[in-house]
């Protein structure tokens, strides 16, 4: 008669490497009497005998995983017990090896020049695959702008036109290599004016051709505005070559005007706009104003009545035939544009435009418009209307998205005088100081001027009608 013998595992479990979808077997050879009951666990959880993913044979001594999945990774143990002595256990690891697999491949991307592009490439595999990228037929080199992230994604900062092309990602480990399909990176470029129209001083009844050239991807369209309205007369000729559009507006001149060339292209649902303006004035138009560019007078209009100080003298530009009507028409057009902007921006922008088109005026031998203090111009740009002016940030273009402000003339902040240099040399905007407490700490200004604590909207160094182009920087 055989003597009872406690179980002894004669073949301890070892680490098993297995490829996904292949078979993996653990062997747990046991000597004992009577025959032991052998059970198996994975990560300390009992494997059920009826689980069809496993096969348990040889009285429980062989555990086979019939088709390995990546989730089968873990510690497998066999436990043998026959009632004699204690149960015995042996454990081994299953390491699931996997050829590289691209789980989130890159997709075609359209991106605006100057922004950041990320092409995804999420991978699986064991050992962890290394990810590289191919552009066209060549391996892509990383640099200060281009980096392959830990996730495998490709990040391109400050996207340039030359980044456009076909890309694919490559995932590689010791077991193999996986390639994504080719994807296209298309770089769109904001509309930008290459050649602005030039101002002209002509005799009554002459013909003038204003030329405006713009570039962008997609190719922009060009429209012309005369004193704030669509051009009513004149002929337009256009040609397109190598993403450059050339527009020529021929005019028969019977009155002075401010002509604005507006180049627009579309990026998804948004538009980018660039603009440049030129004046057409008539020689000897008004002999009485020959030596001055304008005069000081009380504002008698309606649009800016609530914004400008009561009875204030403002500057009227005599390059217009009828300055008061022309400037009122311009502000009226601008006012309509402002309907689309945010409630935070709108009153600030209204103050900006009114003080810009109707600058505070110092009467004297030569009437002089007073520009707005630079810091208040910056406040409108950076604080009150930050979102609306976002498209102005790119150094290459001068227009705005269609945020409701895309046609508005705005001054170039950096060219305005600073309130820190000469507080009496620039104007401030009442609305901004009134509102500033609700938004952020905002500068209060010491000055000998009565409106010292009141910021006034930015004004440009030259009057509106004379300046050939506007931007905010």
């Amino acid at each position: 008669e055989k003597l009872p013998k406690a179980p002894v595992i004669t073949t301890p479990l070892e680490t098993v490497d297995a490829l996904v979808e292949e078979v993996a077997t653990f062997m747990c050879a046991v000597e004992s009497y009577p025959q032991p009951e052998i059970s198996w666990t994975r990560n300390k959880i009992l494997i059920k005998l009826f689980d069809t993913r496993y096969s348990i044979r040889e009285n429980g001594q062989l555990l086979t995983i019939l088709s390995v999945e990546d989730s089968d990774d873990g510690i497998y143990c066999c436990i043998a017990n026959n009632g004699v002595g204690g149960a015995v256990e042996s454990c081994g690891a299953l390491q699931v090896k996997m050829k590289p697999k691209i789980t989130r491949p890159p997709i075609n991307v359209k991106i605006i020049e100057g922004l950041k592009a990320v092409l995804p490439c999420t991978t699986m595999g064991n050992p962890k695959p290394s990810v590289s990228w191919i552009k066209g037929d060549n391996a892509l080199r990383e640099n200060s702008r281009i980096a392959v992230l830990e996730s495998g994604s490709l990040r391109i900062h400050n996207v340039q036109k030359e980044d456009a092309g076909q890309y694919r990602c490559v995932a590689k480990n010791s077991l193999g290599t996986a390639y994504s399909k080719l994807v296209k990176l298309e770089v769109e470029v904001f509309a930008r004016i290459l050649r602005a129209p030039e101002s002209h001083n002509v005799t009554f009844g002459s013909f003038v051709t204003l030329r405006c050239t713009a570039i962008g991807i997609p190719v922009p369209t060009i429209s012309w505005i005369e004193n704030g309205n669509a051009v009513s007369s004149g002929s337009i000729q256009e040609s397109v070559k190598d993403r450059v559009i050339d527009s020529r507006l021929q005019l028969f001149i019977t009155k002075p005007g401010l002509y604005t060339c507006i180049a627009t292209n579309k990026h998804g649902e948004k538009f980018s706009t660039a603009k440049a303006a030129a004046t057409v004035s008539i020689a000897e138009w008004s002999k009485s104003q020959k030596d001055s560019q304008g005069y000081c007078a009380q504002y008698r209009g309606e649009v800016c009545d609530a914004v400008l100080a009561k009875d204030a003298l403002v500057f009227f530009n005599t390059s217009y035939r009828d300055p008061e009507d022309a400037q009122e028409l311009l502000i009226h057009t601008a006012w309509n544009e402002l309907k689309a902007v945010s409630p935070l921006c709108r009153p600030a922008a209204e103050a900006l435009l009114c003080n810009h088109l109707f600058q505070e005026c110092s009467p004297g031998v030569v009437p002089t418009p007073m520009p707005i203090c630079r810091e208040y111009c910056l406040a409108v740009k950076e604080l009150f209307c930050a979102k609306e002016w976002q498209a102005m940030e790119g150094k290459a273009h001068r227009g705005l998205y269609r945020s409701g402000m895309h046609l508005l003339p705005v001054p170039e902040c950096s060219k305005l005088p600073s309130m820190h240099r000469d507080p009496t040399a620039c104007t401030r905007l009442p609305y901004l100081d009134y509102k500033k407490e609700n938004i952020t700490t905002f500068p209060s200004i010491t000055s000998s001027r009565p409106s010292a604590d009141i910021p006034n909207l930015p004004a440009s160094t030259s009057s509106f009608a004379v300046s050939p182009a506007y931007s905010m920087t």
Epitope: A379, E382, L383, P417, S418, H420, R421, D422, P423, P443
Partner: antibody, heavy 124, light 107 residues
């Protein structure tokens, strides 16, 4: 890296002239207002002159008005100080310094970067 | 021109001390005041602007306070690198002016 390098200092007789230059690099020079500040040997700092980014606005200290001229060439990333009718009291280290605005965009940070200075000695 | 007066002219202190320097303006300058640190033979360095805004990269032991005509620069715990001359400067209007300087030396 922002760098300002002054040059043109030296020994000059009273009544003489000198032209200082400041070469700027590491930033968009044409977007910033620039200044000259001086420091007499063993003394404190004195602001001399300022020029706006587009040269539209120029300011001088009363002590140099009519004698000194500030200018800039944005194409060459350079700032200049033409000093005429020099006096002994103009002897100092002359620094060029930049003004900028903080990240909010509208708070001035005066003289946020300085050059190493150039010594001007006015003596007979 | 606006006159700026600093006190004291010289200050002797030890490492770890809390140090305060006062700057007075001859008329109100709101909070348009900057503080600079200068070491011998070197250019000044901007520490504080707008009276209390810390310039990027400047240690947080430096702080500024005040508005109107009275301003204070505080170094909460003096470090060996802080022995230098400190200047205040107003930039409220046209002619920007500096204080005469405060020299912080080792006691």
């Amino acid at each position: 890296e922002v760098q300002l390098v002054e040059s043109g200092g030296g020994l000059v007789k009273p009544g003489g002239s000198l032209r200082l230059s400041c070469a700027a690099s590491g930033f968009t020079f044409s977007s910033y207002d620039m200044n000259w500040v001086r420091q007499a040997p063993g003394k404190g700092l004195e602001w001399v002159s300022s020029i706006s980014s587009s040269s539209s606005y120029i300011y001088y200290a009363d002590s140099v008005k009519g004698r000194f001229t500030i200018s800039r060439d944005n194409a060459k990333n350079s700032l200049y100080l033409q000093m005429n009718s020099l006096r002994a009291e103009d002897t100092a280290v002359y620094y060029c310094a930049r003004d900028s605005y903080d990240s909010s965009g509208y708070y001035l940070r005066p003289f946020d970067y300085w050059g190493q200075g150039t010594l001007v000695t006015v003596s007979s | 021109d606006i006159q700026m007066t600093q006190s004291p002219s010289t200050l002797s202190a030890s490492v770890g001390d809390r140090v305060t320097i006062t700057c007075r303006a001859s008329q109100s300058i709101d909070n348009w005041l900057a503080w600079y640190q200068q070491k011998p033979g070197k250019a000044p360095k901007l520490l504080i602007y707008k009276a209390s805004s810390l310039e990027s990269g400047v240690p947080s032991r430096f702080s500024g306070s005040g508005s109107g005509t009275e301003f204070i620069l505080t170094i909460s715990s003096l470090q060996p690198d802080d022995f230098a001359t400190y200047y205040c400067q107003q930039y409220n209007s046209h002619s920007w002016t500096f204080g005469q300087g405060t020299k912080v030396e080792i006691k």
